[in-house]
């Protein structure tokens, strides 16, 4: 660490005195101090001398000696007072700039330590400090306003009591700047705009910040627009607003509009798209397939996306049949607005009943006309099976009827013993019927198929089973020949109730 001679923390001299400050270190040393006149600097190897033969109050201050080559960065300091009876203050700067909540040091240095007891801080023209101003004083450094606030941006003077009268320093202007957290906050409304050619439109770009120093502009397809700016201050924020008013829009007004604001922290921008159309439009679409298949008893939501300008004048869901004249309950229909020109309409169909299969249509209307989007809802059913014994063309025949959706496949099984359902160990023969006869196949209804199994002789200690299956499930019917005739019954586990 460098050593200063004289080796005292502070030195008090009179104006006109000769002052010599010598600093010695292991290597080269350097002096730093307040800007002041009359000093002569002489350096020689590891020592450096600051001297003046005519000290003035302006030489008052702290002089620090450092050794640039010292990795520990050690330093030594001495404070010099040049006590001028006419000049109690040496003001090092007439403007101080700090950020809010920082300590603000007003650098009025007392030229005579004896005066410390009678110092005070005032605002210019003798006005008292604002309430809640918390400050302290150091004769070496000046007055510190602690945790300075924006409202304390004022002109201050340091006051010292000399011979019973107050002597003021020159004024020091304090500028307390708002802490700017980032680029200005932006809003651009609307987020999207559609107009028919000839209509009026308005786009508003606004930016706000805690600091007034920011710029905002609106650009159309990368061309900056010349728009008068409205400025305001509320909620402790500065606001700048640009409003673009278009009385009669045309196609050249369409395109991308960007609202851009910038300050020292950076830039923010937000964009919107303006569409100009020739006439009103209404488009309906769905992300779903318009042909829907759902298992009976399950639920379904039908969704329609609507793009429209101008806005919708009416809309509704309608059931077009074929089963009944019931209409969807309004409580099951709901609308959500994605944005100004796009909406989603949903029809909820919980626990679907057989009578609810059919066509559902969403209708919407705006000045562009009516549009409709129709869904076809088919219900899926597991097969229901029945078997009867009959004679066809004189031949004994087992006739199996299976009804379900999608169309069931039919398999016949012959197994030993009397059983409700053939299991693998009992099976004697299996016949697949790849092409059962379709008895009925109407839209939105079950498909009924019939399969015939010609049996020359019914074996009495055997069971004949008709099995039907589709993507939903399966059903079966066991036929047991008995001496008194034939006995048929469905398996106990299959009792279908729609």
């Amino acid at each position: 660490i460098p050593v200063i001679e004289p080796s005292v923390p502070e030195l008090v001299v009179k104006p006109g005195a000769t002052v010599t400050l010598r600093c010695v270190g292991n290597g080269s040393v350097e002096w730093d101090g307040p800007p002041s006149p009359h000093w002569t600097l002489y350096s020689d190897g590891s020592s450096s001398i600051l001297s003046t033969n005519n000290a003035t109050f302006q030489n008052t201050g702290t002089y620090r000696c450092t050794e640039p080559g010292d990795p520990l960065g050690g330093s030594a300091a001495i404070h010099l007072y040049v006590k001028d009876p006419a000049r109690p203050w040496n003001v090092l700067a007439q403007e101080v700039v700090v950020f809010e909540d920082q300590d603000a040091l007003l650098p009025c240095l007392l030229t005579d330590p004896v005066l410390e007891a009678g110092v005070s801080l005032v605002r210019v023209r003798g006005r008292p400090l604002m309430r809640h101003t918390n400050y302290s004083f150091s004769p070496w450094h000046g007055f510190t306003i602690h945790r300075a606030k924006f409202i304390q941006s004022q002109d201050y003077q340091c006051s010292a009591l000399m011979g019973g009268r107050k002597v003021m320093s020159i004024s020091i202007r304090l500028k307390v700047q708002k802490v700017i957290p980032g680029p200005p906050a932006l809003t651009l409304v609307p987020a999207e705009l559609v107009r028919i050619r000839g209509e009026a439109a308005q786009i508003v770009c606004s930016a706000s910040s805690v600091d007034v120093n920011f710029d905002v502009f609106l650009q159309h397809n990368n061309t900056k627009l010349a728009i008068p700016q409205q400025s305001d201050f509320h909620n402790n924020r500065y606001q700048k607003v640009l409003t673009l008013n278009l009385d009669q829009v045309d196609f050249q007004h369409a395109g991308n509009y960007s609202c851009v604001a910038s300050n020292v922290q950076g830039k923010h921008s937000t964009s919107m798209f303006f569409r100009v159309v020739e006439s009103a439009y209404l488009n309906l679409s769905s992300e779903q397939n318009l042909i829907q298949e759902v298992t009976v008893g399950e639920g379904l939501n039908l969704k329609v996306m609507v793009e429209a300008y101008p806005g919708l004048q009416g809309f509704n869901w309608t059931y077009l049949g074929p089963f009944s004249d019931h209409q969807p309950e309004p409580k099951l229909a709901n609308a959500t607005t994605k944005d100004t020109y796009r909406h989603t309409f949903t029809l909820s169909l919980p626990r679907l009943k057989p009578s609810e299969a059919g066509r559902y249509s969403f209708l919407a209307r705006n000045p562009g006309g009516w549009r409709a989007l129709t869904f076809e809802l088919t219900l899926r059913y597991p097969p229901e099976v029945s078997v009867i014994w009959t004679f066809i063309n004189g031949s004994g025949t087992l006739l199996c009827a299976a009804s379900g959706y999608p169309q069931p496949n039919v398999t016949w099984l012959q197994c030993s013993g009397h059983t409700d359902r053939c299991d693998e160990a009992q099976v004697l023969q299996v016949w697949d019927d790849p092409y059962p006869e379709v008895l009925s196949q109407e839209p939105f209804h079950k498909v009924t198929v019939q399969s015939l199994l010609t049996v020359e002789t019914l074996e009495h200690n055997q069971t004949y089973e008709c099995r039907a299956h589709n993507s939903v499930g399966s059903g079966s019917w066991a036929f047991i020949p008995i001496s008194a005739g034939a006995h048929t019954h469905p398996p106990d586990e299959f009792l279908f109730t729609p």
Partner: antibody, heavy 117, light 108 residues
Framework: QVQLQESGPGLVKPSETLSLTCTVS????????WSWIRQPAGKGLEWIGR???????NYNPSLKSRVTMSVDTSKNQFSLKLSSVTAADTAVYYC???????????WGQGTMVTVSS | EIVLTQSPGTLSLSPGERATLSCRAS???????LAWYQQRPGQAPRLLIY???SRATGIPDRFSGSGSGTDFTLTISRLEPEDFAVYYC?????????FGQGTKLEIK
């Protein structure tokens, strides 16, 4: 080794505010004065002003009404704002360490600022 | 403010020659607060001399400064190719700090 680096927009529109930041690396910003100097193309150097790390400032009287300097010791940065700029403010702007007895001993490499619409 | 006037405006010399650059102040400047800078094309100025006669760190001893009051001189004893540049004097003792208009040292 202390290094200084100026940053800010290279293009500013007339009547707007020029904002520049000088970042000090390789050493502390504390306990020194820091100055801004500018140099129009092909011309000499003009001192704009200086700031101490406590926030004390001294400005060139010719620019005083338009200049604000500030310091952020936590980021080792100091800043310059010059308001109501005109084409005459087009220049290379330098930041420098300002030593009471040793002049401007460290300089940034400079940043060109053009004032144009 | 203190006005500094440098002369000559341009100085044409050959490598190896001696260069003498002058700086005159409109009022007395303490020699403690007079500096000289070198600026090469496209670069920032570099401190050569402070306190009228003290060489800054890393500056070759062919550069020397002298003078007091209102007249100051920068001397380059033996010009090297890299010395051809613009030189500015500056006073930093009185606000506002001011620079001379510069002397361009060019190869003859």
């Amino acid at each position: 080794q202390v290094q200084l680096q100026e940053s800010g927009p290279g293009l500013v529109k007339p009547s707007e505010t020029l904002s520049l930041t000088c970042t000090v690396s390789g050493g502390s910003i504390s306990s020194y004065y820091w100055s801004w100097i500018r140099q129009p193309a092909g011309k000499g150097l003009e001192w704009i002003g200086r700031i101490y790390t406590s926030g004390s400032t001294n400005y060139n009287p010719s620019l005083k009404s338009r200049v604000t300097m500030s310091v952020d010791t936590s980021k080792n940065q100091f800043s310059l704002k010059l308001s109501s700029v005109t084409a005459a403010d087009t220049a290379v702007y330098y930041c420098a360490r300002d030593r009471t007895f040793y002049a401007f001993d460290m300089w940034g490499q400079g940043t060109m600022v053009t004032v144009s619409s | 403010e203190i006005v500094l006037t440098q002369s000559p405006g341009t100085l044409s010399l050959s490598p190896g020659e001696r260069a003498t650059l002058s700086c005159r102040a409109s009022q007395s400047v303490s020699s403690t607060y007079l500096a000289w800078y070198q600026q090469r094309p496209g670069q920032a100025p570099r401190l050569l001399i402070y306190g009228a006669s003290s060489r800054a760190t890393g500056i070759p001893d062919r550069f020397s400064g002298s003078g007091s009051g209102t007249d100051f001189t920068l001397t380059i004893s033996r010009l090297e190719p890299e010395d051809f540049a613009v030189y500015y004097c500056q006073q930093y003792g009185s606000s506002p700090y001011t620079f001379g208009q510069g002397t361009k040292l060019e190869i003859k």
